[in-house]
Interface confidence: low
C-alpha cells in the first residue's frame, strides 16, 4: 500500500481493532517505555493492514503447553508498507507483535537501510500484558522528516535465540528539486560555444529543467535533468540560470555571469620605488584583467631628453608581482616609462606616462693618458692627464683620486692625493729614491670615486741621475703599462 | 507577504563590532541572496555585499572585506552582518534587502533599516 | 567600479508638474540591469523600477523609465504629493553594486 502524507491528512486511530486477549477499552498502556522525548507528529500509521500474507521473518516457538500443543509463530503483525510525505512534515508508524507471556525481556530495536537506529530518536514501546501474551507496540515518528529519512525502516526483536524481521516500511519524503549540480561561472571568448550543467533530483522524480538567460528562459520546452545548455556564443556578458521544476514546486539555481574575454584595461598608478644611477625600480598596479589572467608585462623606457633619438627601450617581464627593476640606464638622465600587460587576447594599452631620473653615479671609467715624470731638478714627480668623456662621469667631477706607491727594497708605502675638479695635472714630492714610483688616478663625482686608471711606474734614480723622459699609461691593446726609463 | 524584519538599533563605541539580524519570511528563504545597504546620516546608499543563504557563497565589496562577515541561519531563516572594527563614519542605518536571484540585480524587498550609531 | 551621477541633486515642483531626473553611468551598462528605487523620509528605500522601464508591483502608471547604454531617465508625469521622495538610480551590471548620489523633490 502507498500512502501519501498530505497536510489535511487526519491521524489514524492508534488501535483500528483489538488485539488477542481483554485489552482494555481506553487502550490505555500498562506499560510504556520511551527510547527519547517524542513530539506530537503530524501524521500516523496503523500498526495493522488486514488481509495480507506475511513476508518477514517468522519463529516458531519451541516451548509447550501442558497439553503439549505448539504455539502458534511470532511475527510482526502487518503495518503500512510505504509512505510518501513531504519535507518538514511529521510521520509516526509501528510495528506490533504479540508476544506469549512465556517470554521475558523481549526487546524491539528499530533499523533503517540495515543499520540499528540509536541515541535520540523518537522511539516509544508499549506493552499491553493479557492473561497468555503481550501486545507490543513499537512506535517510530519524525517530527520534521528530511531528505536524508528516507529509505527502508524495519523492526527486530530477539526471542528464544531467533530474530523476528518486520516488513521494512519505506518512508518516501519528498520536497521541491534538490541541485547537486548548478551551472558555474565562466569566462568565454567571444562568439565561442561553451556548455554549461545543471542538475536537480527529487523525490519526486521526473526533474525538468529550464534555462534562463538574463531573466529571459532559453528552451520553451524543459529538458529532463540533467541538462546541458550549449551556448553558441556570446558578445556581451550574460547571466545564466537554471530553473528545476517537479510536482512540488520550482528551485531556482544562483544566477552565474558569464563573462566576455577582452584585452586588459591598462595598468595604473605606475610609481617609481626606487632610484640608482644606471637603473630604476618601478611597481603598477594592474588594470582589470579582461577575464582573463595576465600572462605578462612590457615596460617601455625612452629618453625624455628633447635630443634624444626617441628610441624605446623595451623590458619583457612575468605579470607578477607587479614590479621591476629596470637596468642599463644612463646616470643624471630623465626617462618616460609606461607599462602594459598582455592576457590571452592581447596588449593592453599602456599606462600613463611617467617621468623618473637616475641619480649621480661615480665616474664608470677612469681618466685617460695618465703621464708621469721625474723633474728631478725641484725633486717632484709631474702627473698629467684628460678627463674621461663628460657622458660616462655619471655626474658632476667634484675631483680626481691619486694613487702613488713607492717600492725599495723591502719598502712599500701608498700615499693618497685629493686634487680640484678643474685641474688636469699635479705635482707630487718624491718619497724615495733608488725607488720605483706607481701612480694611478681616479675621478670622483658625488656619487662616489670611479675606477682607478691603469698604473704607470717610473724609476726615481738615486741623486745625481738626469731623466727627462716620461712614463705614461699604455696605448690601447698593449697589456702592461710601458716603462720608459 | 514577503517580509524582511532587523534588529534594534546600536550604539556601539569606536573599535567595536556590532551584529545585525534580518528575519525573512513569506519566500523561500534559500532561494534569494540577501543583501546589506547602508545609508549615513543625509548621504545615499552604499551596498556592502550579499549572502546566498542555500550555500553560504558571499561577495563583498572591497571597501568592506575583511571588517565585514554575512552568514545566515537557514533553521530560523535569518541573515546576519557584523562589521567590526567600527568607526564613527560607520555611524549609518543599515539595510538588509532581498536580491532579485538572477543577478540582474535589484532589490525588490527591504528590512525597515537598523540604525548603529559609533560614538566615544 | 562603476558610478552613477545622477541630475539634480534637488528639485522643487508643483503638483501636476512633469518631472524628468537622469542618471548617467561611467561605462555602458545593458537596459537589463538598470534600476529605480523611491525613499520616502523615514522609510526604507522601495522598488520603483526595474530593468530600465519595468514598473515594480503596485506602483502608480505616472512613473516611467527609459534609457540606454550610459543615459537613464525617470519620468514622473502629473507629479502628486506623495511623490515627495528621494530618487535613486541603481545598476546591477558588476560587483560592487552602485547607485546614485539621489535626487530629492520637494513638492511646492
Known amino acids: 500500500a502507498i500512502t501519501e502524507a498530505r497536510e489535511e491528512a487526519k491521524p489514524y486511530p492508534l488501535f483500528p481493532g483489538p488485539f488477542p486477549g481483554s485489552l482494555q477499552t481506553d487502550h490505555t498502556p500498562l506499560l510504556s517505555l520511551p527510547h527519547a522525548s517524542g513530539y506530537q507528529p503530524a501524521l500516523m500509521f496503523s500498526p495493522t493492514q488486514p488481509g495480507r500474507p506475511h513476508t518477514g521473518n517468522v519463529a516458531i516457538p519451541q516451548v509447550t503447553s501442558v497439553e503439549s500443543k505448539p504455539l502458534p509463530p511470532l511475527a510482526f503483525k502487518h503495518t503500512v508498507g510505504h509512505i510518501i510525505l513531504s519535507e518538514h512534515k511529521g510521520v509516526k508508524f509501528n510495528c506490533s507483535i504479540s508476544v506469549p507471556n512465556i517470554y521475558q525481556d523481549t526487546t524491539i530495536s528499530w533499523w533503517k537501510d540495515g543499520k540499528e537506529l540509536l541515541g535520540a530518536h523518537h522511539a516509544i514501546t508499549q506493552f499491553y500484558p493479557d492473561d497468555e501474551v503481550t501486545a507490543i507496540i513499537a512506535s517510530f515518528s519524525i517530527t520534521s522528516v528530511q531528505r536524508s529519512d528516507n529509505g527502508s525502516y524495519i523492526c527486530k526483536m530477539k526471542i528464544n535465540n531467533e530474530e523476528i524481521v518486520s516488513d521494512p516500511i519505506y518512508i518516501e519524503v519528498q520536497g521541491l528539486p534538490h541541485f547537486t549540480k548548478q551551472p558555474e561561472s565562466m569566462n568565454v571568448t567571444r562568439n565561442t560555444a561553451f556548455n554549461l550543467t545543471c542538475q536537480a533530483v527529487g523525490p519526486p522524480e521526473p526533474v525538468n529543467i529550464f534555462w534562463v538567460q538574463n531573466s529571459s528562459r532559453v528552451n520553451e520546452q524543459p529538458e529532463k535533468s540533467p541538462s546541458v545548455l550549449t551556448v553558441p556564443g556570446l558578445t556581451e556578458m550574460a547571466v545564466f540560470s537554471c530553473e528545476a521544476h517537479n510536482d512540488k514546486g520550482l528551485t531556482v539555481s544562483k544566477g552565474v555571469q558569464i563573462n566576455i574575454k577582452a584585452i586588459p584595461s591598462p595598468p595604473t598608478e605606475v610609481s617609481i620605488r626606487n632610484s640608482t644611477a644606471h637603473s630604476i625600480l618601478i611597481s603598477w598596479v594592474p588594470g582589470f584583467d579582461g577575464y582573463s589572467p595576465f600572462r605578462n608585462c612590457s615596460i617601455q623606457v625612452k629618453e625624455a631628453d628633447p635630443l634624444s633619438n626617441g628610441s624605446v627601450m623595451i623590458f619583457n617581464t612575468s605579470a607578477l608581482p607587479h614590479l621591476y627593476q629596470i637596468k642599463q640606464l644612463q646616470a643624471l638622465a630623465n626617462y618616460s616609462i609606461g607599462v602594459s600587460c598582455m592576457n590571452e587576447i592581447g596588449w593592453s594599452a599602456v599606462s600613463p606616462w611617467i617621468l623618473a631620473s637616475t641619480t649621480e653615479g661615480a665616474p664608470s671609467v677612469a681618466p685617460l693618458n695618465v703621464t708621469v715624470f721625474l723633474n728631478e731638478s725641484s725633486d717632484n714627480v709631474d702627473i698629467r692627464w684628460m678627463k674621461p668623456p663628460t657622458k660616462q662621469q655619471d655626474g658632476e667631477l667634484v675631483g680626481y683620486r691619486i694613487s702613488h706607491v713607492w717600492q725599495s727594497a723591502g719598502i712599500s708605502k701608498e700615499l693618497l692625493e685629493e686634487v680640484g675638479q678643474n685641474g688636469s695635472r699635479a705635482r707630487i714630492s718624491v718619497q724615495v729614491h733608488n725607488a720605483t714610483c706607481t701612480v694611478r688616478i681616479a675621478a670622483v663625482t658625488r656619487g662616489g670615486v670611479g675606477p682607478f686608471s691603469d698604473p704607470v711606474k717610473i724609476f726615481i734614480p738615486a741623486h745625481g741621475w738626469v731623466d727627462y723622459a716620461p712614463s705614461s699609461t699604455p696605448a690601447p691593446g698593449n697589456a702592461d703599462p710601458v716603462l720608459i726609463i | 507577504q514577503v517580509q524582511l524584519v532587523q534588529s534594534g538599533a546600536e550604539v556601539k563605541k569606536p573599535g567595536a563590532s556590532v551584529k545585525v539580524s534580518c528575519k525573512a519570511s513569506?519566500?523561500?528563504?534559500?532561494?534569494?541572496?540577501i543583501n546589506w545597504v547602508r545609508q549615513a546620516p543625509g548621504q545615499g546608499l552604499e551596498w556592502m555585499g550579499w549572502?546566498?543563504?542555500?550555500?553560504?557563497?558571499?561577495k563583498y565589496n572591497e571597501k568592506f572585506k575583511g571588517r565585514v562577515t554575512m552568514t545566515t541561519d537557514t533553521s530560523t531563516s535569518t541573515a546576519y552582518m557584523e562589521l567590526r572594527s567600527l568607526r564613527s563614519d560607520d555611524t549609518a542605518v543599515y539595510y538588509c534587502?532581498?536580491?532579485?536571484?538572477?543577478?540582474?540585480?535589484?532589490?525588490?524587498?527591504w528590512g525597515q533599516g537598523t540604525t548603529v550609531t559609533v560614538s566615544s | 567600479e562603476i558610478v552613477l551621477t545622477q541630475s539634480p541633486d534637488f528639485q522643487s515642483v508643483t503638483p501636476k508638474e512633469k518631472v524628468t531626473i537622469t542618471c548617467s553611468a561611467s561605462?555602458?551598462?545593458?537596459?537589463?540591469?538598470f534600476h529605480w528605487y523611491q525613499q520616502k523620509p523615514d522609510q526604507s528605500p522601495k522598488l520603483l523600477i526595474k530593468?530600465?522601464?519595468n514598473l515594480a508591483s503596485g506602483v502608480p502608471s505616472r512613473f516611467s523609465g527609459s534609457g540606454s547604454g550610459t543615459d537613464y531617465t525617470l519620468t514622473i508625469n502629473s507629479l502628486e504629493a506623495e511623490d515627495a521622495a528621494t530618487y535613486y538610480c541603481?545598476?546591477?551590471?558588476?560587483?560592487?553594486?552602485?547607485f546614485g548620489q539621489g535626487t530629492k523633490l520637494e513638492i511646492k
Open positions: 530593468r530600465t522601464s
Open positions: 549572502i546566498y543563504p542555500r550555500d553560504g557563497y558571499t
Open positions: 534587502a532581498r536580491g532579485y536571484y538572477d543577478n540582474l540585480y535589484y532589490f525588490d524587498y
Open positions: 561605462s555602458i551598462i545593458s537596459s537589463n540591469y
Open positions: 513569506g519566500y523561500t528563504f534559500t532561494t534569494y541572496d
Open positions: 541603481q545598476q546591477g551590471r558588476s560587483v560592487p553594486l552602485t
